[in-house]
């Protein structure tokens, strides 16, 4: 039950995160005109990854796409690439995770296959989230650098009668959406990976238990060689009768391949 909840919650959180990454990528407000300590203008500028916009005080808004590919800064291209990679990985992760959900039955899909798919989608969500966070952070760093450069320019070359105003840009809403969305996708991915551990069936049998016969101190290992190696008739993960009752807490499983994420 807990595994299903963790997997379901991981899926929902990732879904919200990826929706947020898509929204952030499409948003025009990656950078907005800095209004602090600036002359108040009747025009407000803001820029996105794909176009720049100008909103006049009257409400009239005009947006122009970046119709060049080669003329754009390399950093902007890198941010675009990171965001697109994040969206693509996230979308594939969502598709995979839908089939991996424990609550959804698809034919005779085994738990081991679902566990693998859950792990795959989890990793994809983690990478997707990291791509989004990296993309937004690169853009934010670019803004900070440009902000201080333009601030320095504002206070130089003012000896003449005519002053020029440099438009400075600061963090736009899309950056915060991107950071939050990337974080959610990352958290969702981690949750999927955690859920995967619970979904993974035991690949080894229960640990051998010592039985003490009256008057003797003989250790009895049920299942013999087969039980300890996993070869032979027990490869299908059937539980071998161990001849003794035990509580759930006493059952110890060896680490499976899904434990190291």
């Amino acid at each position: 039950m807990a595994v299903t909840a963790c997997q379901g919650l991981g899926f929902v959180v990732s879904l919200i995160g990826i929706a947020g990454i898509i929204a952030a990528t499409c948003m025009d407000q990656w950078s907005t005109q800095d209004l602090y300590n600036n002359p108040v203008t009747a025009v407000f500028n803001y820029q996105g990854l794909w176009r720049s916009c100008v909103r006049e005080s009257s409400g009239f808004t005009e947006c122009r796409g970046y119709f060049t590919l080669l003329g754009l800064p390399a950093m902007l291209q890198a941010v675009r690439a990171l965001m697109i990679v994040g969206i693509v990985l996230g979308a594939i992760g969502l598709l995979v995770s839908i089939f991996a959900l424990k609550c959804i039955r698809i034919g005779s899909m085994e738990d081991s296959a679902k566990a693998n798919m859950t792990l795959t989608s989890g990793i994809m969500f983690i990478v997707s989230g990291l791509c989004a966070i990296a993309g937004v952070s690169v853009f934010a760093n670019m803004l900070v650098t440009n902000f201080w450069m333009s601030t320095a320019n504002m206070y130089t070359g003012m000896g003449g009668m005519v002053q020029t105003v440099q438009t400075r840009y600061t963090f736009g809403a899309a950056l915060f959406v991107g950071w939050v969305a990337g974080g959610l996708t990352l958290i969702g991915g981690v949750m999927m990976c955690i859920a995967c551990r619970g979904l993974a069936p035991e690949e080894t049998n229960y640990k051998a238990v010592s039985y003490h016969a009256s008057g003797h101190s003989v250790a009895y290992k049920p299942g013999g060689f087969k039980a300890s190696t996993g070869f032979g008739s027990n490869t299908k993960n059937k539980k071998i009768y161990d001849g003794g009752a035990r509580t759930e807490d006493e059952v110890q499983s060896y680490p499976s391949k899904h434990d190291y994420v």
């Epitope: 005109q33 002359p39 108040v40 203008t41 009747a42 025009v43 500028n45 803001y46 820029q47 720049s52 916009c53 100008v54 006049e56 005080s57 009257s58 409400g59 009239f60 005009e62 122009r64 005519v162 002053q163 020029t164 105003v165 438009t167």
Partner: antibody, heavy 118, light 113 residues
């Protein structure tokens, strides 16, 4: 069609207050911004204030402390409250609609004369 | 505040001739975001309110005759009347439509020679 009609002007003593009105028709004050511009006799135009469609306001820094722009959306009427009037406030006061493009003023009223004199 | 300086203060031009009015702002009116200059030109005839002629420094308002044109960028702007007509006798004002407070130039009185 778009029409702006100013009223409330007249002769007033220095230090007194006056409220000008601008009745707008043919458009809504919640869709377009409206400016107040004044012109002293034989002088040039002086921008006074604006109230934008969203309700935000901007003023001429020299007049900001004494003048207040407001509107009544239900009456589609704009107001200019003028306090502590001085002789130099004597002028024709125009209200003008903000154009949708370029921040220009595309429709003007005929103006109302305000004379500040003792 | 932005200072708008118009020149000349008055201008006399013969009918059919070209009239040129200049306007200079103390700061650039060019918006980097859309590469538009937020300068507006108005015409005011005696006893009438001003009339919008040109916005964005060079875009003519609808209904304004083609003989009126605007040019310039940054801080220096020009209003040109290609062929002066009798009805063009008026005072012409430029306006900063970029920075608050919006400011007008002192005006240029255009007369017929």
């Amino acid at each position: 069609q778009v029409q702006l009609v100013e009223s409330g002007g007249g002769v007033v003593q220095p230090g007194r207050s006056l409220r000008l009105s601008c009745a707008a028709s043919g458009f809504s004050l919640t869709t377009y911004g409206v400016h107040w511009v004044r012109q002293a006799p034989g002088k040039g135009l002086e921008w006074v204030a604006v109230i934008w469609a969203g309700g935000s306001t901007n003023y001429n820094s020299a007049l900001m402390s004494r003048f207040t722009i407001s509107r009544d959306n239900s009456k589609n009427t704009l107001y200019l409250q003028m306090n502590s009037l001085r002789a130099e406030d004597t002028a024709v006061y125009y209200c003008a609609r903000a154009a949708y493009y370029g921040n220009g003023l595309d429709y003007w009223g005929q103006g109302t004369m305000v004379t500040v004199s003792s | 505040d932005i200072v708008m300086t118009q020149s000349p203060d008055s201008l006399a031009v013969s009918l059919g001739e070209r009239a040129t009015i200049n306007c200079k702002s103390s700061q650039t009116l060019l918006n980097s975001g859309n590469q538009k200059n937020y300068l507006t030109w108005y015409q005011q005839k005696p006893g009438q309110p001003p009339k919008l002629l040109i916005y964005w420094a060079s875009t003519g308002e609808s209904g304004v005759p083609d003989r009126f044109s605007g040019s310039g960028s940054g801080t220096d702007f020009t209003l040109t009347i290609s062929s002066l007509q009798a009805e063009d006798v008026a005072v012409y004002y430029c306006q900063n439509a970029y920075f608050y407070p919006f400011t007008f130039g002192g005006g240029t009185k255009l007369e017929i020679k």
